[in-house]
């Protein structure tokens, strides 16, 4: 008992932590003072009726990853205030409704990763009227979803079901929940997908399918009844798909009349782009989809890919596309020309070079594009990049951060409406007239700049942290500046006069510099009450670098002696 007690530490607010220890039971002596109890990653196997009896004010109980195989019927009977209960990854093979009946305040319940076959003989959750987040199921033994399983639940913020090995689904089991903001469904096989889809289409806003092999998925007509689909977003995460099954999936998506957003994360496309036009013409209508997001798409036979033109017509209404970290080195000109409504394109962490970008940003490409993100690609020349993008007449925001430009030419051409340019982490060591005068926001943080002397008459925000600047920029060159972030440079001081010269400045972040705490600097910073409103990282990040006896101390706390400040 005593060693158990020693593994638990509680603060004055009743937050008790005892995770990752060697507890083999819930420590004794817990009282009404305990508000939160984290005993995750221990060796607790048994919860008795008396363990938590006095914890009447307990709001959060985390027991994940223990070896719990038994919970006595009335173990939670006094936990009427409990809002958060995590019993995931234990050895509970039978779930009892009596555990949950007293938990009238429960908003979060996690039962994932326990070896039960079903969710019990009676409706487990019918008394949990405040429940918002529910996680159930496991990877191997949970094989059956029954009609009564979710009875009594009317609204859920999030429902996660690990039905990886599901073999039986009783129709209407999920239909009883009137509204689910986000349903996450883990299914290895697609066998019961359509049956579940029919039940959730009118109650789920965001549907996420995980870990599913859709290589052989075939869509067959659904009897969805008269209800309209509520699904606004469909996410496929770690899903396998082929050329053929992609079209089957698109037929399924056709059933969702209000679908606005489609997302593919960590998916594998086992195909070569062999999309049959006949199929396409007959069944595919992109509907209202405005946003397409693809992250870390793996195409094993990528270099065998050929004609994608059958997909082009599907893209004309899409407004936002993200294709991130998917080894994209070329967007075909014809595809770019078809993306007539595209306003936002994010191609971060790909393989684009200027010469192939030229093919993508051809004449009439992306006519509505306003934001282009090419962060961490293979761009190497600012001059070529700017020139390549001249075809994009409506482009206002460009992020080309994390490309290695090193140098900057004296002049560059850019689209004429440019307002935002991100050149952070591009290894540049100077800024020149290459930067467009039309900018309102410029980010050149994390580079090798030791000087900033550009006249940017319309600039409102300058992000220049993590460089080598020794002074604040000249305010007269930046007459409209509202925000200046210049932390972690080599600035040793700044004066009231300097700050006042930035007439429009509302926000300054200048912490993490090597401040020389002179008497002048200290009196200015400590006496100006209004300074704290402008300096958003004050006082924590403003430390003295010298004199040596105050090094590391916060500027606001340092007091120099009279003799130090009145030397003749």
């Amino acid at each position: 008992e005593s060693s158990n007690q020693a593994s638990l530490s509680c603060d004055r607010n009743g937050i008790c932590k005892g995770s990752s220890g060697s507890l083999n039971s819930i420590p004794s002596g817990l009282t009404e003072a305990v508000k939160s109890l984290d005993l995750s990653n221990n060796r607790i196997t048994y919860i008795s009726n008396s363990d938590l009896q006095r914890c009447v004010n307990l709001q959060a109980l985390v027991l994940t990853s223990n070896g719990i195989n038994t919970i006595e019927e009335d173990s939670f009977s006094s936990l009427g205030s409990l809002e958060h209960l995590d019993l995931s990854y234990n050895y509970l093979s039978n779930l009892s409704s009596s555990w949950f009946k007293p938990l009238s305040s429960l908003t979060f319940l996690n039962l994932l990763g326990n070896p039960y076959k079903t969710l019990g003989e009676t409706s487990l959750f019918s008394h949990l009227t405040k429940l918002q987040i529910l996680r159930v199921g496991n990877m191997d033994t949970f094989t059956k979803i029954q009609r009564k399983d979710f009875a009594g639940l009317t609204f859920l913020e999030e429902l996660e079901i690990d039905a990886s090995d599901l073999q039986s689904y009783e129709p209407k089991s999920l239909k009883s929940i009137q509204n689910v903001s986000h349903l996450i469904l883990h299914m290895k096989q697609h066998i019961l997908l359509l049956e579940i889809f029919v039940d959730v289409t009118s109650s789920v806003e965001c549907l996420e399918l995980r870990d599913t092999d859709l290589d052989t998925f075939h869509f067959s007509e659904l009897s969805t009844g008269e209800t309209n689909s509520l699904i606004k977003k469909f996410t496929f995460r770690n899903v396998k798909i082929t050329d053929e099954s992609l079209f089957q999936v698109m037929k399924l998506l056709n059933q969702i009349s209000g679908l606005l957003e489609l997302e593919f994360d960590d998916c594998t496309l086992n195909g070569v782009g062999n999309f049959r036009a006949s199929d396409n013409d007959r069944v595919i209508d992109p509907g209202k989809v405005e946003t397409l997001t693809i992250r870390r798409l793996h195409i094993p036979r990528f270099y065998l890919f050929y004609d994608l033109s059958t997909l082009y017509s599907l893209t004309e209404r899409v407004k936002r596309i993200t294709v991130e970290n998917s080894k994209v080195f070329l967007v075909p000109c014809l595809l770019s020309q078809h993306l007539k409504s595209l306003e936002y394109l994010d191609l971060s962490e790909n393989l684009m070079v200027e010469e192939y970008l030229k093919n993508s940003a051809c004449e009439d490409a992306w006519p509505s594009l306003q934001t282009l993100i090419l962060r961490q690609n293979h761009l190497a020349s600012l001059e070529k990049t700017g020139e390549t993008l001249l075809t994009l007449k409506n482009l206002t925001n460009i992020d080309i951060s994390k490309n290695s430009f090193h140098s900057m030419p004296e002049t560059c051409q850019w689209p004429e409406k440019m307002k935002y340019l991100n050149l952070s982490s591009t290894r540049i060591h100077s800024v020149t007239g290459c930067i467009p005068k039309t900018l309102e926001i410029l980010d050149v943080s994390n580079n090798n700049l030791n000087l900033f002397s550009l006249n940017l008459p319309q600039l409102k925000e300058l992000y220049i942290s993590r460089n080598k600047l020794m002074t604040l920029p000249d305010a007269s060159l930046l007459p409209m500046l509202l925000v200046l972030k210049i932390s972690r440079n080599a600035i040793t001081t700044f004066s009231k006069e300097q700050l006042d010269s930035f007439h429009t400045l509302k926000t300054l972040e200048a912490g993490g510099n090597n401040f020389i705490c002179s008497c002048e600097f200290l009196s200015f910073t400590q006496e100006q009450q209004a300074l704290a409103k402008v300096l958003i990282d004050w006082p924590a990040n403003y430390l003295c670098d010298s004199p040596s006896h105050v090094r590391g101390q916060q500027v606001q706390d340092v007091r120099l002696s009279v003799s130090e400040c009145h030397r003749t």
């Epitope: 793996h298 080894k327 014809l334 962490e349 994390k402 290695s404």
Partner: antibody
Amino acid sequence: QVQLQQSGPELVNPGASVKLSCKASGFTFTTYGINWVKQGPGQGLEWIGWIYPRDGSTNFNENFKDKAALTVDTSSSTAYMELHSLTSEDSAVYFCARLTGGTFLDWWGQGTTLTVSS
Amino acid sequence: DIVLTQSPASLAVSLGQRATISCRASESVEYYGTSLMQWYQQKPGQPPKLLIFGASNVESGVPVRFSGSGSGTDFSLNIHPVEEDDIVMYFCQQSRKLPWTFGGGTKLEIK
């Protein structure tokens, strides 16, 4: 300045294995692919395969699938190629090269000479 | 596999004149309007050096006397005017389909 520094020459016995290294500097290692190319004595160039350090994904020339294994250590920005069951046919200069734009090899290591002989 | 045939295997050229090396692919290396064909130069005892990528884009730092042209299956590398430093080996390479392949090489010689 971009650099790919390859390990020194190797003399190994037939049937043995050897691990060649390629240390990258002057660029963000995880942003680019690393390719390996073989050049036999007085011969042309033969593409072996690539590895992308960011996710460890590889692609091989079928002729080298059972011969070469590609790995990376991102903490030291180093790529490795291990060659197995060596024969005299494997005697060659092996180059590592940076893959840019998904299609071209813009920076090359100086090459490692491998001699397989008893 | 895509086979790349370079011709001629060796080319004798006078300094100051134009040298044209040809590379023919057994199938098209076109990829959505871009030809995925590269040219490399290799000096004795050194690694290859990229000259041209995407059939016609001159790599940064490569002298303007080097140019590339062609599309589909037929490509050429032009050097004009040829300098003494150019009298070495040249290879073409395709990256349209795996496995990537190189041409057999063309050796430039002084006439």
